[in-house]
């Protein structure tokens, strides 16, 4: 039994982690600067998307890049519990706090803000430079989706790395996982064409859920053959003229559930991965 | 002046490097196994490409993946001169060999075979599983293109890493370079839509040359609207019914020079990067 409550311990761990973050701001500031620069570069490359076939390619391309970038950037989250492993074991055994207090304290003070920032920065910069769908709900759905991708990827990193002593193996494993997840995200291969004995792998792909949600959010209702004189040409039938046609070709459900089920899946993955990470920390004591 | 000729020294360095390679086969065998597995996985995912809009997406996707995979795999080439840096300085100062002998010896025995193998393996496995263009010249052009991409990416790795003492900085720099090169390769963004003040960056992108060559090689003469006569003049700006239309939309020159200029560009990059790497080794002595 502990002399202090869970909430008191949570506050204490959070405060210390946050102080460490502010006391060593180089990493945080560097991450923000890199994100801003990358956001501006992406914004400049894709500036002012067209409503034609190049507009389809560029929209899909930039949404794919943002999703996979969120995943690969989250690999750095492997350090969260690895770097302080010895300190955690020492303090936990000394009765300073519960595992749960340490776990949630670190998440709240470190993971939550550091994974939220890039999503906010990217969306604010990229959205208006590219001229994505000009509605408030679409803007916030994009921001929320990028956050969910970052959190699920980071949670996966924690689940793999928690309790380990070296970062490198976890990093390698994460990178390999994300490469395969990236293939199954839906840009490099049309998911409707994959053989059934392999296609189930798409359901384990974090970027697939993020990319599908971002596409659903952006493509729905878009016209990619605007003003095409529809009285003339038959070969135009092979064009993808609406966002709905594009989404259907990608095997994406057009209903509202077709959007939100991706966030539900990401939320489930976050819960599962964080549970694994928590259990790995919990069983650390037995082997230390 | 040296008592032995350049050719003798070259043979000696090559033989020693090759013996090291055979004496420690785990790395080489591991690389081959990983390449075979990845080739089979890619072959299974993309098995039997269709001749419709999904066929366009899947062809572009797999060619993009193979190109970028060749680039990112080549990051490991940074180790070639870094790991043996102290040994090289010691032996060079002791008059064992010329810088040129060591340089070309290492290239011939280590870089040449280890970068050639993945290209051969990938092409042999993927080409027939996917059902790419069934002509011998297209098969060997693909193999040659993947080799050229691997060599230029490895040369860039050597140019960055030569003379350095630690691998990590060079690896990070390479990865960042390849991420930007990947954006400019032509899948994630339609290169014809990039603003002129930025579009010149595509000419420094290794995967762009590889991807363009592979697409030119594969798409030319293909029909993606089965049932529509491919010779019909398509005045619809939005439909992509032939490989030529697809290539034109991507801003790719349809002439034979539109294919071979990519290999010329990659060859020039190889020469430039290897020259930089050689000069960096040459000037190492001054600072050691």
């Amino acid at each position: 039994s502990y002399t202090t409550s869970f909430c008191h311990q949570l506050r204490w761990v959070s405060k210390r982690s946050f102080k460490n973050l502010l006391g060593n701001p180089q990493a945080s500031i560097a991450q923000i600067i890199v994100t801003v620069i990358l956001g501006l570069v992406i914004g400049a490359i894709y500036f002012g998307l067209n409503n034609d076939s190049t507009g389809i390619q560029n929209r899909a391309g930039v949404l794919f890049f943002l999703t996979t970038n969120q995943c690969f950037s989250s690999v750095s989250a492997v350090e969260l519990f690895v770097v302080e492993k010895k300190l955690f074991i020492h303090e936990y055994i000394s009765g300073y706090y519960r595992v749960s207090s340490y776990f949630f304290g670190k998440l709240l003070s470190d993971l939550l803000p550091m994974r939220m920032l890039p999503s906010i920065i990217f969306t604010c910069i990229v959205y208006f430079m590219l001229g994505l769908k000009p509605t408030a709900d679409a803007f916030f759905i994009m921001m929320f989706t990028l956050m969910m991708v970052a959190y699920s990827a980071s949670s996966m990193a924690l689940a793999i790395a928690a309790g380990q002593s070296v970062v490198s193996v976890a990093t390698l494993l994460m990178t390999i996982c994300f490469v395969f997840m990236m293939i199954f995200s839906g840009l490099l291969v049309n998911l409707t064409t994959i053989a059934s004995w392999l296609s189930w792998l798409q359901y384990f792909s974090i970027p697939r859920y993020g990319f599908t949600a971002l596409q659903h959010n952006e493509f729905l209702g878009q016209n990619f053959c605007p003003g095409l004189n529809a009285t003339v040409n038959n070969t135009c039938n092979y064009a993808t003229c609406t966002g709905e046609e594009y989404l259907t070709k990608q095997g994406i459900d057009l209903s509202p559930w077709g959007l939100w089920k991706n966030h539900v899946a990401l939320a489930c993955m976050i819960v599962i991965f964080l549970t694994i990470a928590y259990l790995k920390l919990l069983f650390l004591k037995k082997y230390s | 002046s040296y008592t032995t000729s350049f050719c003798h020294q070259l043979r000696w360095v090559s033989k020693r490097s090759f013996k090291n390679l055979l004496g420690n086969p785990q790395a080489s065998i591991a690389q081959i196994i990983v390449t075979v597995i990845l080739g089979l996985v890619i072959g299974a995912i993309y098995f039997g490409l269709n001749n419709d809009s999904t066929g366009i997406q899947n062809r572009a996707g797999v060619l993009f993946f193979l190109t970028t995979n060749q680039c990112f795999s080549s990051v490991s080439a940074v180790e070639l001169f870094v790991v043996e840096k102290k040994l090289f300085i010691h032996e060079y100062i002791s008059g064992y060999y010329r810088v040129s002998s060591y340089f070309f010896g290492k290239l011939l025995s280590d870089l040449l075979p280890m970068r050639m193998l993945p290209s051969i393996i990938f092409t042999c496995i993927v080409y027939f599983m996917l059902g790419l263009k069934p002509t011998a010249d297209a098969f060997f052009i693909m193999m040659f293109t993947l080799m050229m991409v691997a060599y230029s990416a490895s040369s860039m790795a050597l140019a960055i890493a030569a003379g350095q003492s630690v691998v990590s900085v060079a690896t990070l720099l390479m990865t960042i370079c390849f991420v930007f090169m990947m954006i400019f390769s032509g899948l994630l963004v339609n290169l014809t839509t990039i603003a002129s003040w930025l579009s010149w960056l595509q000419y420094f992108s290794i995967p762009r040359y590889g991807f363009t060559a592979l697409q030119h090689n594969e798409f030319l003469g293909q029909n993606f609207c089965p049932g529509l006569n491919a010779t019909v003049n398509n005045t619809c700006n939005y439909a992509t019914c032939t490989g030529e239309e697809y290539l034109t939309k991507q801003g790719i020159d349809l002439s034979p020079w539109g294919l071979w200029k990519n290999h010329v560009a990659l060859a020039c990059m190889i020469v430039i990067f290897l020259t930089i790497a050689y000069l960096k080794l040459l000037f190492l002595k001054k600072y050691s």
Partner: antibody, heavy 118, light 106 residues
Framework: EIQLQESGPGLVKPSQSLSLTCSVT?????????WTWLRKFPGNKMEWMGY???????NYNPSLRSRISISRDTSKNQFFLQLNSVTTEDTATYYC???????????WGQGTLVTVSS | DIQMTQSPSLLSASVGDRVSLSCKAG??????LAWYQQKLGKPPKLLIY???SLQTGIPSRFSGSGSGTDFTLTISSLQPEDVATYFC????????FGSGTKLEIK
């Protein structure tokens, strides 16, 4: 010259299904384009309802997606509209038209007035 | 949905007059706007697409202008057969129509 003609009952009871047919002459519906249903309410407001493409792909107005269905009979060169659970609000003149995607409509049917009333 | 607002809802003009009808979009629709003419008991007839392109077979007295959110249909010299209701349609995002302007002769 392509011609489109709507047909169907002029009176439908609330909560029932509205079914309309569009017969196309002068062009085969599987050869191309998107075959669209629109309606004009008594207050002059026009609404795009959805389409079925030459390939059979259907696209509906999100506000109607839960109760609309567009189908076709290629042998008769006809396409159909079914609107379920109608209310008096669905009273309108229903048009079929040809276009590509969301683009302007150069070809229209004459329109058929459907009244929803008990 | 993008709201399309047409003004005025009723317009009276004399034969030979230059007449301008306005259509405002709730948000930017680029130049993806079409104009239709609908006479009583008839289906709508496409006049203008892409804001200013005249549909084949339409008299040259009809012209369209505007981009973004503000658009105008102009009849350079009003004819008796031009009495009708005029609709605008945006096709930038999904497709929506204006509520129409009824044009009559004084």
């Amino acid at each position: 010259e392509i011609q489109l003609q709507e047909s169907g009952p002029g009176l439908v009871k609330p909560s029932q299904s509205l079914s309309l047919t569009c017969s196309v002459t002068g062009y085969t519906i599987t050869s191309g384009y998107d075959w669209t249903w629109l309606r004009k309410f008594p207050g002059n407001k026009m609404e795009w309802m959805g389409y079925i493409s030459y390939s059979g792909f259907t696209n509906y107005n999100p506000s109607l997606r839960s109760r609309i269905s567009i189908s076709r009979d290629t042998s008769k060169n006809q396409f159909f509209l079914q609107l379920n659970s109608v209310t008096t609000e669905d009273t309108a003149t229903y048009y079929c038209a040809r276009t590509r995607g969301y683009n302007p409509f150069p070809y229209w049917g004459q329109g058929t007035l459907v009244t929803v009333s008990s | 949905d993008i709201q399309m607002t047409q003004s005025p809802s009723l317009l009276s003009a004399s034969v030979g007059d230059r007449v301008s009808l306005s259509c405002k979009a709730g948000r930017n629709v680029n130049n993806y706007l079409a104009w239709y003419q609908q006479k009583l008991g008839k289906p709508p007839k496409l006049l203008i697409y892409n804001s200013n392109s005249l549909q084949t077979g339409i008299p040259s007295r009809f012209s369209g202008s505007g981009s973004g959110t503000d658009f105008t249909l102009t009849i350079s010299s009003l004819q008796p057969e031009d009495v009708a209701t005029y609709f605008c349609q945006q096709y930038n995002s999904w497709t929506t129509f204006g509520s129409g302007t009824k044009l009559e002769i004084k």
